[in-house]
Interface confidence: low
């Protein structure tokens, strides 16, 4: 299709050149148009050679435009400020790990790990998440205590055709607390952080579903699920947020070979959700109350809800027995935040429209790397920033709000010709004073073009140098918001720009 368009351009340009010749146009004009025609023909020639190679990003990846980057930076800024407010340190780890480090940590998802071609003896894989590398880092450095955040790209050989809207390279934002502490205090803080971030981002109403791996395992045991089927039945239960119980039951019975009556018992439990009262009700359940694991999990959740009430976020949390996050390494509390779509009918419950953050407790992961199997209890969360980026982008598109892609505070412009030197001197002064400034890279730009660029880029101020102003020792400062224009003495300019853009004093 693009080649056809190019051929059409060549045809039109050829006709244009013939027309100019017939009209006896000037030699310069004809030469200029012939040059254009030759360039188009050259492009067509190159295009033949390029037929095989389609210029695009690899499957499941994408570029970020300046506009998207601006959105991304804002989102990251909200997240990082929250992590820092809670006293987290920051670490970084390699993009690739030894294959052995990642092996056996992700259960069924292991098939999605990217393996690298052998590079001189070391078998390597791209990291699949930030949690396993964190556990490796703790074990390797013999750390038993740290509160850290890590924002980086991870890689999954997901087939995007099967999971639309998912990427093979994407960012994760993780916060984790490692160390032996009193039960549920760090877990409650993780949930508090999740709520703070999601509230600050203002992406809509959300709900955090909470469960515990021990409750799930205990529930499966009392319902009669064989140990060997726990994990596979877990993955079926986890689909309940997307499909009906009938479909989940069919999968358990039809595909996974579970007895229908066992599935029905599971159904009685997993379709329940509520608050602390549901925890108390299940502690009285004749079957669950006899299972040690389930009782431990329920006891911890009861305590967790006490802390969530103190943190003022209990209204955002729902104990949901169908939450069964897929990763093998979770050992205790698990949680997942979903955006809510408000009900269309009065009396209906709000609908969940996809996970935007998740996490849980994984007390055994570090022990997998320690030669002596020493465990370091850990709890953490991951913010689904890719999903959040697209929600924020959607919202901006809908509101047609202009997104600034630079932080330039002032454009240095000139009203007359031959003032390039003055513009260069002034912009340099501003840079040295820590002011974010720009100028157009032309010797004699038209004032109108400079002002047009200033408006389109959304730069708050323009400093205009004119010959008369130079003689008077002033600069005209115009504001995009108020359209007012004032003469400012050259020596006061930096201070005036700072005042108008509320920038604290800072230099390079």
């Amino acid at each position: 299709a693009d080649r056809a368009a190019l051929e059409e351009l060549v045809r039109l340009q050829g006709a244009h050149v013939r027309g100019l010749k017939e009209q006896k146009a000037s030699a310069e004009q004809i030469e200029e148009e012939v040059t254009k025609l030759l360039k188009l023909k050259a492009q067509l020639g190159q295009d033949e050679g390029k037929q095989k190679f389609v210029l695009k990003t690899p499957k499941g990846t994408r570029d970020y435009s300046p506009r998207q980057m601006a959105v991304r930076e804002k989102v990251f800024d909200v997240i990082i400020r929250c992590f820092k407010r809670h006293g987290a340190e920051v670490i970084d780890t390699p993009v690739f790990e030894l294959k052995e480090t990642l092996t056996g940590k992700y259960g069924e998802d292991s098939k999605l790990i990217y393996d690298l071609k052998d590079q001189g003896g070391e078998l390597l894989s791209l990291r699949y998440d930030l949690t396993v590398p964190f556990a490796r880092y703790l074990a390797m450095n013999k750390l038993t205590n740290i509160k850290r955040y890590h924002i980086a790209k991870v890689y999954r050989r997901d087939n995007p055709a099967m999971t639309r809207g998912r990427y093979r390279e994407f960012y994760q934002c993780d916060f984790d607390i490692a160390g032996q502490f009193d039960p549920m205090i760090p877990d409650a803080e993780c949930l508090k952080i999740m709520c703070e971030i999601l509230s600050s981002l203002q992406i809509g109403n959300f709900l955090v579903k909470v469960n515990d791996r021990r409750i799930l395992d205990g529930m499966f045991a009392v319902c009669g699920v064989p140990d060997s089927k726990f994990r596979t039945i877990c993955s079926s239960v986890d689909k309940l947020d997307k499909v009906s119980w009938e479909e989940v039951k069919n999968e358990m019975v039809g595909e996974k070979g579970l007895a229908p009556e066992v599935a029905d018992r599971i159904g009685d439990y997993v379709q329940q959700h509520g608050g602390v009262s549901l925890v108390e009700q299940l502690l009285q359940d004749p079957k669950l109350s006899q299972n040690k694991q389930a009782v431990e999990g329920l006891g911890d959740l009861k305590l967790l809800f006490e802390y969530l009430i103190l943190f003022g976020i209990d209204d955002k949390i729902s104990f949901d027995l169908s939450l069964a996050r897929g990763l093998d390494y979770y050992t205790g509390v698990i949680y997942e935040a979903v955006l809510l779509q408000m009900p269309t009918q009065a009396g209906e419950e709000p609908l969940g429209v996809g996970s935007i953050a998740a996490g849980g407790r994984y007390d055994g992961l570090v022990g997998m790397f320690d030669p002596k199997g020493r465990k370091v209890p850990c709890v953490g969360l991951s913010i689904g920033v890719e999903r959040i980026f697209s929600i924020v982008e959607q919202r901006l598109e809908a509101s047609e709000e202009k997104v600034r892609t630079t932080e330039t505070q002032v454009l240095v412009a000139s009203a007359q010709k031959k003032l390039l030197e003055e513009r260069l001197k002034l912009v340099s002064e501003l840079w040295d004073a820590g002011i974010k400034a720009e100028l157009l890279y032309k010797k004699n730009p038209k004032l109108l073009n400079q002002l047009q660029y200033w408006e389109e880029a959304g730069i708050p101020l323009v400093a205009i140098i004119g010959e008369q102003e130079l003689r008077d020792g002033v600069i005209k400062l115009r504001s995009v918001a108020s359209r007012e224009e004032v003469d400012v003495r050259r020596e006061d300019l930096v201070e005036e720009i700072r005042r108008r853009t509320n920038q604290p004093l800072s230099t390079c």
Partner: antibody, heavy 122, light 110 residues
Framework: QVQLVQSGAEVKKPGASVKVSCKAS????????IGWIRQAPGQGLEWMGD????????NDNEKFKDRATMTADTSTSTAYMELSSLRSEDTAVYYC???????????????WGQGTLVTVSS | EIVLTQSPATLSLSPGERATLSCQSQ?????????MHWYQQKPGQAPRLLIK???NLESGIPDRFSGSGSGTDFTLTISRLEPEDFATYYC?????????FGGGTKVEIK
Amino acid sequence: QVQLVQSGAEVKKPGASVKVSCKASGYTFTDYCIGWIRQAPGQGLEWMGDICPGDTYTNDNEKFKDRATMTADTSTSTAYMELSSLRSEDTAVYYCARGEEQLGLRNAMDYWGQGTLVTVSS
Amino acid sequence: EIVLTQSPATLSLSPGERATLSCQSQSVSTSTYNYMHWYQQKPGQAPRLLIKYASNLESGIPDRFSGSGSGTDFTLTISRLEPEDFATYYCGHSYEIPWTFGGGTKVEIK
């Protein structure tokens, strides 16, 4: 130029199977997915599923999951769709169409075959 | 699955007039964002792609065709109908499996 050429019309009895072929040319076969869409007489379009010859992944419309099989032969740049246990309501024109895969999402279907009429009648 | 509803079912207009076709997506879980495409089909022919991703004009399609909308409401506009534009138009999404199409809008000569 990109072309998708489909096999000729077929008349089948209820309970039989039909296999429609779609030969692609003018582009790299493994870079794009091939979707199958059908249109019953006087009706709208219905997506049946697709196959990505580059990695042999298929996506199916649950409605046809047990009866439709999509395959691709990269050596001949040909995609196939086989529909089994035919019934009279399967009488339709079956189209193959190219859908570019980009950013992990399938694009719109930009090139279509001429269609294959399958008539199911006893 | 996402249900796409096109309106009107039939649009009777004269050449030179402006045509506005609507497509609404209904889904319990999500909007289709901008993964919406428009196709034109003439009797006895295969569909032809006009607009992809809600508003991007496919190469070789005249610029009298334009698309807009995002989320759940999408519109195809033909600014001035030419004789060859009288056909049936379908919207179709590629957001999730299964892809679905609207029932179509037939644009006929008044």
